[in-house]
Structure formats: C-alpha cells, structure tokens
C-alpha cells in the first residue's frame, strides 16, 4: 500500500522538516526559516509560535517541531499551552485587581499564584489545632482533645458541636 500511495502521491515521501513544493514539481523542499512540519507528506510548513513580550522561549522552533514558550521570571502561565502570563505574588498573598495583597486573617496561600484559601476547620473532623495557621501555611490538625486524655478509648468520638467563632459548613 505504501508503494502504491507514493506512486499516486509523490508528496507522501516528503519527511518531517520539509514540504511538498507544488511550484517545483512536487519535490520536497526544506521548511523556510521560522516554520516547521512535524509530520511527513505536508504541502505547507506551519509558522512557528513566537515568544514575545512577557513570554520567553522554553524550546526553540526547529524544522520539525514548534517553539514552546513560558513566562519570564516573576510570572506564571495561564490557559492552554501557556497562552497568557500572570504576575507572581509572594506566599501569603493573592493577586487582586489592585495588585498583590496579603491574605486576610483565617486564610492562607502557600504558592506564588492562586487565591487565599480558608484554614482547615479541625473541629469538623473532631480534631484540635496542633499548629496555628499563618498567611503562608494552613493549620495542622492533631488528635481530638478526648484522644489525648488518659484512659481515652481508641474509638474516635463524634465531632463536637461547633466551636465558637466557626460557622457551620
């Protein structure tokens, strides 16, 4: 079948990195600069993606593969294929329309991107706070107070009624 196909279509012999040039008797011509063909038998080469402005080149375009972009330092990718860049913030902050803002009390963000999230409510799992939360870190929940009392059974007690200051979830 391959032989039959190549007799019918000389373009099928053109490898990746070339295109079948109709203007030159269908011979295989190399892709021009800033273009590529990732598969054989192509009648045109595709233009390479350009990494400009806030983007930087992660992988150069070659005759057989497209360029890949990421964001310059201080920024991170958003969207499919890093289609947009967004400013980083510090841990303990989130990006708002007014820029990077510290997380409100009771919330944290342990990354340079994304939003501040509420601390875990340990009491909902019948546990107590072992390590307090900060703007950068979630609380660490420990065993429930009942588990720590001498002679406590190993059966986990039911979750207590909600603690003051916590609304039911």
């Amino acid at each position: 079948f391959e032989r039959t196909r190549s007799l019918q279509d000389p373009c099928s012999n053109c490898p990746a990195g070339t295109f079948c040039d109709n203007n030159r008797n269908q011979i295989c011509s190399p892709c021009p600069p800033n273009s590529f063909s990732s598969a054989g038998g192509q009648r045109t080469c595709d233009i390479c993606r350009q990494c400009k402005g806030v983007f930087r080149t992660r992988k150069e375009c070659s005759s057989t593969s497209n360029a890949e972009c990421d964001c310059t330092p201080g920024f991170h990718c958003l969207g499919a294929g890093c289609s947009m860049c967004e400013q980083d913030c510090k841990q303990g902050q989130e990006l708002t329309k007014k820029g990077c803002k510290d997380c409100c009390f009771g919330t944290f963000n342990d990354q340079k991107r994304g939003i501040c999230r509420p601390w875990t409510n340990c009491s909902l799992d019948g546990k107590s706070v072992l390590v307090n939360g900060t703007k950068e870190r979630d609380v660490v929940c420990g065993p429930s107070p009942a588990d720590l009392s001498p002679g406590a059974s190993s059966v986990t007690p039911p979750a207590p009624a909600r603690e003051p200051g916590h609304s039911p979830q």
Partner: antibody, heavy 116, light 107 residues
Framework: EVQLVQSGAEVKKPGSSVKVSCKAS????????ISWVRQAPGQGLEWMGD????????NYAQKFQGRVTMTRDTSTSTVYMDLSSLRSEDTAVYYC?????????WGQGTMVTVSS | AIRMTQSPSSLSASVGDRVTITCRAS??????LNWYQQKPGKAPKLLIY???SLQSGVPSRFSGSGSGTDFTLTISSLQPEDFATYYC?????????FGQGTKVDIK
C-alpha cells in the same frame, strides 16, 4: 487597579505627524508589552506594533514600518506612539493595550483626524 | 501574516437566544486565540483567552472552544448587555491579527 490613560483627540494635516501618549496609572507596566491597535471609523481592529517598556524594544507591523515609532519614559510610566507622513486613511481611534498573551487592559482611545 | 475570518459578519438575535460565532485562521494557531467584545464608542474588552479560558469577571454564559484553525464563541443565553461587536484575535505569531468582527444586534 492599573489603568491606561491616553492623551486627547488630535486633528492633523496630511503629511504631518502625531504623537499619542499612554500612561499607566495605579501601577506600572511591569514586564508586559504595550501594543498599539487602531480602528478606522466603522472598521475593525488593526495591530500596529508593540513595545516592552522595561527593555525599550519595539516591534512594528510591516505595514507601518518606517512611519511609526514607539518609545517609553519609565520615570513616568508612559509609552508613546509617533506616526508620521499622515494621510486621510490614518483617521482612526488609536488604542494602547497591555499585552500578556491577550490584550486585557485597554486605554480609552485617542481619536486622530487627518484632514486638510 | 495569519488571516482571521469570522462568520457571520452580523446576526440578529433575541434575549435568551443561544448565539454562536465562528473564527477561522489561515494556518494552525493551536489554542492561541482570544475573543473580545466591543460596544460603540468604547474600547474592546477581553472575554476569552487561550481559546477556552474565561477572563476574570466575565459571565459564565460566555464560552470558547476550538483548536488548530477553527474556533467558536458561544453565548448560552443572550442578555440585553451582550448586544455588541465581537472580535477574535490570534496571539500565535506577529503581526497579531484580528477577525473582521461580528455584530450582534436585536432581532
């Protein structure tokens, strides 16, 4: 919140030049490019070129090469677009826009009228 | 330059209608396609980036899809404030280019 504030409307004679400014208020340009996009009356959007303010490097669409110059003043967080040899077809609203892979913040636009 | 072609050029629709606008690139642009809304006398507003990601603050009735050369903007239930002109734009290779626009007006 970062806003892009442009200079006011201009009326120019054919053959003259116009310089439109775009100032970042409430923030800085950061590492983003600032593009200039124009829109003739009743027409679509046309990209003219861009500049990365922190580097001062400009890149122009071929159609405007030789007629357009984009510059910046980092001390005032302002970019400028200078278009020379004006003709009637250059009558348009000129927008600056922050480019981070998409134009997410736009200036209010500057109407440039070219008329003898 | 990569040519962007939108269809239709204009359409008439009623509040509550589902509206679909298409955009075709003259060569593959992967998912580097943005959609904007423009109202008379105003600057364009970014709706969708990366073909399908909703820009912050944009209502969820707007959605985008597609990859390669064919893309779609869908408004699931048209609202009075959605009557405007919509543009696609490729951010794959300079010069960045826009479609000619699709005007959505009241039936």
């Amino acid at each position: 919140e970062v806003q892009l504030v442009q200079s006011g409307a201009e009326v120019k004679k054919p053959g003259s030049s116009v310089k439109v400014s775009c100032k970042a208020s409430g923030g800085t340009f950061s590492s983003y490019a600032i593009s200039w996009v124009r829109q003739a009356p009743g027409q679509g959007l046309e990209w003219m070129g861009d500049i990365v303010p922190i580097f001062g490097v400009a890149n122009y669409a071929q159609k405007f090469q030789g007629r357009v110059t984009m510059t910046r003043d980092t001390s005032t967080s302002t970019v400028y677009m200078d278009l020379s040899s004006l003709r009637s077809e250059d009558t348009a609203v000129y927008y600056c826009a922050r480019d981070r892979g998409a134009f997410d913040i736009w200036g209010q636009g500057t109407m440039v009228t070219v008329s003898s | 330059a990569i040519r962007m072609t939108q269809s239709p050029s204009s359409l008439s629709a009623s509040v509550g209608d589902r509206v679909t606008i298409t955009c075709r690139a003259s060569q593959t642009i992967s998912s580097y396609l943005n959609w904007y809304q423009q109202k008379p006398g105003k600057a364009p507003k970014l709706l969708i980036y990366g073909a399908s990601s909703l820009q912050s603050g944009v209502p969820s009735r707007f959605s985008g899809s597609g990859s390669g050369t064919d893309f779609t903007l869908t408004i699931s239930s048209l609202q009075p404030e959605d009557f405007a002109t919509y543009y696609c734009q490729q951010s794959y290779s300079t010069p960045w280019t826009f479609g000619q626009g699709t005007k959505v007006d009241i039936k």
